[in-house]
């Protein structure tokens, strides 16, 4: 502060700055006029003994003689462009003359007016039946503000010992209502912004699965309380889980875009169809009203049951050597809509019964031809078979003469009926 | 004599530049604060801006925010208006105006007491 | 931004008629509006500053009024050459804003 400026006589101040009083925004001028012979100096702005560095001020010199050496008018004039609470103070004028420090006399800047909001209730959409919060908070000059809450334009009984509530505590409302807070002082009343509290309905709870089918769920759900609005349709999303899924679980948004059925409710329950066999989904669940929808449920986890596969074992070969009959084959290539649990075997021949063996899950088997009686078109079919059950079944396939050097057969050839020169096999 | 001469208006594409000069005489232009102030045809006034060429300091209003600039050389007692991405809803007669400052120490507000003749601006294909 | 409504927008009036403009704010201003005077093709020209002082060279047949949100400008005899749009302005707060504008016509 500048402790050594003079404002006894001598002083070449000859107007100093009046005084401002005024609400939040307003735009003043301070004016300040002095008279000096010579050169005129510059006119710097002080709030409360400080410099103002950036002063929005202008400056005139007006000469009142015909030479620079004459008198001079200096007129300074300092804009508050939009009073704000840092602005309010001790304004003064100073120009340093001949090595002196001149100041002028104060003027000064207040700043009183209506209640100024530092925080306005805001819009929110909220579950029915649930306790929300909406803040309000509001300023002087002049001191002090009271505050009046507002529900659909009636005013609230200000909560015992809390005349001036910044936090409005609700327990709940049934209906979209509409809040807005009023702040009082000595100048009058302002009215805050009206904020709109939508009710939404409360988040689904007990999300569940009815029944599993390969291809089918069946889930059923209870929903949450919807205030006056009855819920028109809840929407389900189904996801297909992946070794991912831990990471977006948390967050709101699965990483790609997930199956969304709508349904209308009552009865809450849905049938989800054309799913594939012993998979891993997430399901959530959210019921809308006219307000809008309520929350998501959190990621449900649920899988579907197992399928038969859906194709015979492919490649299917009978080769006799001797007295044994090698049979081969290969995995289905169609999906096997669960745990491949293993191969069935059967074969006949023309006039006896058919003969039925579990496998494993190895791909070929050595049967043993045994007897004397001879067996006509003797044939092998064979099916896979999960925890659902088999497959189909290949189709029949006749027994082929060993050829020498054949190798692995990797499908079988169409040939000649077999001799009938074998009996019953035996293993 | 106090005056403002206006000049630099015309015709100008969308999306264009126009520079427009405001001449003052008969008073220092670093003692006052300078307004353009523009009326589109047939409407009423509007307010585009104002500058203190005595510290440079410029203010605008939000419909030219970042598009017009508002600068002043008080050597040549002139201030400017640089205006930048031209619309068609810029067409308007823009007019400089001096600010009264002939209270005593203190104001609330203020007034336009000395005004050019006004140049026409027109932005059209 | 403040608003300031001006009425009537257009009036007709003789010579030697009082005519009085209102202008309303649409928050309060204090004394902080000025009134103009506009021709056509010409600029305006200040009448009233601070609500209600005289600008100076201005017929004393003008004069301001109000506070607050309410003014007034009145013409206590109307004269040929005051036939021209009048606005008000207010400069409590940036931005500064105009009325539309009140055009007085000969009747």
């Known amino acids: 502060a500048h402790k050594d400026t003079q404002t006894e006589a001598g002083s070449p101040f000859v107007g100093n700055p009046g005084n401002i009083t005024g609400a939040r925004g307003l735009t003043g001028t301070l004016r300040c006029e002095l008279q000096v012979q010579g050169e005129p100096p510059e006119v710097v702005w002080l709030r409360d003994g400080q410099i103002l560095e950036l002063a929005d001020n202008t400056q005139t010199q007006v000469p009142l003689g015909e030479d620079w050496q004459d008198e001079w008018k200096v007129v300074s004039q300092l804009r508050i462009s939009a009073l704000q609470l840092s602005d309010a103070g001790e304004y003064q004028c100073m120009v340093h003359l001949e090595g002196r420090t001149f100041v002028s006399q104060p003027g000064f800047v207040g700043l009183e007016g209506l209640p100024y909001f530092l925080e306005e209730p805001e819009d929110k959409a909220v579950p029915a039946n649930t306790p929300f919060n909406l803040s309000c908070q509001a300023q002087g000059p002049p001191e002090p503000v009271t505050l009046l809450w507002l529900q659909d334009a009636v005013p609230l009984a200000p909560v015992t010992g809390h005349s001036s509530q910044h936090s409005l505590q609700t327990p709940g409302l049934n209906k979209t209502s509409s809040f807005s807070c009023e702040a009082h002082n000595a100048k009058g009343v302002t009215t805050s912004r009206t904020a709109t509290i939508t009710v939404l309905p409360q988040r689904p709870h007990h999300l569940h699965v009815v029944s599993r089918q390969p291809t089918e769920l069946e889930v059923a759900w209870t929903p949450g309380l919807s205030g006056i609005y009855p819920l028109t349709h809840c929407n389900l999303q189904a996801v297909l889980s992946d070794d991912g899924v831990g990471i977006w679980l948390g967050k709101s948004d699965p990483p790609e875009d997930p199956l969304t059925l709508q349904v209308s409710v009552p009865p809450h329950q849905l049938r989800l169809e054309k799913l594939l066999p012993h998979t891993p989904y997430h399901i959530r669940i959210s019921c809308s009203s006219s307000q809008g929808p309520s929350p998501w449920t959190h990621w449900l986890p649920v899988e579907t049951t197992e399928g038969v596969p859906l194709g015979p074992p492919e490649n299917v070969s009978a080769m006799r050597n001797g007295s044994q009959v090698l049979v081969r084959w290969q995995e289905p290539r169609v999906p096997l809509q669960g745990t491949l649990l293993g191969y069935r075997l059967a074969y006949r021949g023309q006039d006896t019964p058919e003969v039925l063996m579990d496998i494993g899950l190895t791909r070929e088997v050595t049967l043993e031809l045994r007897g004397d009686r001879p067996v006509a078109n003797l044939t092998v079919s064979v099916t896979a078979y999960t925890s659902a059950g088999d497959g189909p079944w290949s189709l029949p396939v006749p027994l082929e003469p060993w050829r020498p050097g054949q190798g692995q057969p990797l499908h079988h050839l169409v040939s000649e009926p077999p001799p009938r020169a074998f009996s019953w096999p035996w293993w | 004599e106090v005056q403002l001469v206006e000049s630099g208006g015309g015709l100008v594409q969308p999306g264009g530049s126009l520079r427009l000069s405001c001449a003052a005489s008969?008073?220092?232009?670093?003692?006052?604060?300078i307004h353009w102030v523009r009326q589109a045809p047939g409407k009423g006034l509007e307010w585009v801006g104002w500058?203190?060429?005595?510290?440079?300091?410029?203010y605008y209003a939000d419909s030219v925010k970042g598009r017009f600039t508002i600068s002043a050389d008080t050597s040549k007692n002139t201030a400017y208006l640089q205006m930048n991405s031209l619309r068609a809803e810029d067409t308007a007669v823009y007019y400089c105006?001096?600010?009264?400052?002939?209270?005593?120490?203190?104001?609330?507000?203020?007034?336009?007491?000395?005004w050019g003749q006004g140049t026409l601006v027109t932005v059209s294909s | 931004d403040i608003q300031m409504t001006q009425s009537p927008s257009s009036l007709s009036a003789s010579v030697g008629d009082r005519v009085t403009i209102t202008c309303r704010a649409s928050?309060?201003?204090?004394?902080?509006v000025a009134w103009y005077q506009q021709k056509p093709g010409k600029a305006p020209k200040l009448l009233i500053y601070?609500?209600?002082f005289l600008y100076s060279g201005v017929p004393s047949r003008f004069s301001g009024s109000g506070s607050g949100t309410d003014f007034t400008l009145t013409i206590s005899s109307l004269q040929p050459e005051d036939f021209a749009t009048y606005y008000c302005?207010?400069?409590?707060?940036?931005?500064?804003?105009f009325g539309q504008g009140t055009k007085v016509e000969i009747k």
């Open positions: 302005q207010q400069s409590y707060t940036t931005p500064p804003t």
């Open positions: 105006a001096r600010e009264y400052s002939g209270w005593g120490g203190s104001s609330v507000g203020y007034a336009m007491d000395y």
């Open positions: 500058i203190n060429p005595y510290r440079g300091y410029a």
């Open positions: 928050q309060d201003v204090s004394t902080a």
């Open positions: 008969g008073f220092s232009l670093s003692g006052s604060w």
């Open positions: 601070s609500a209600s």
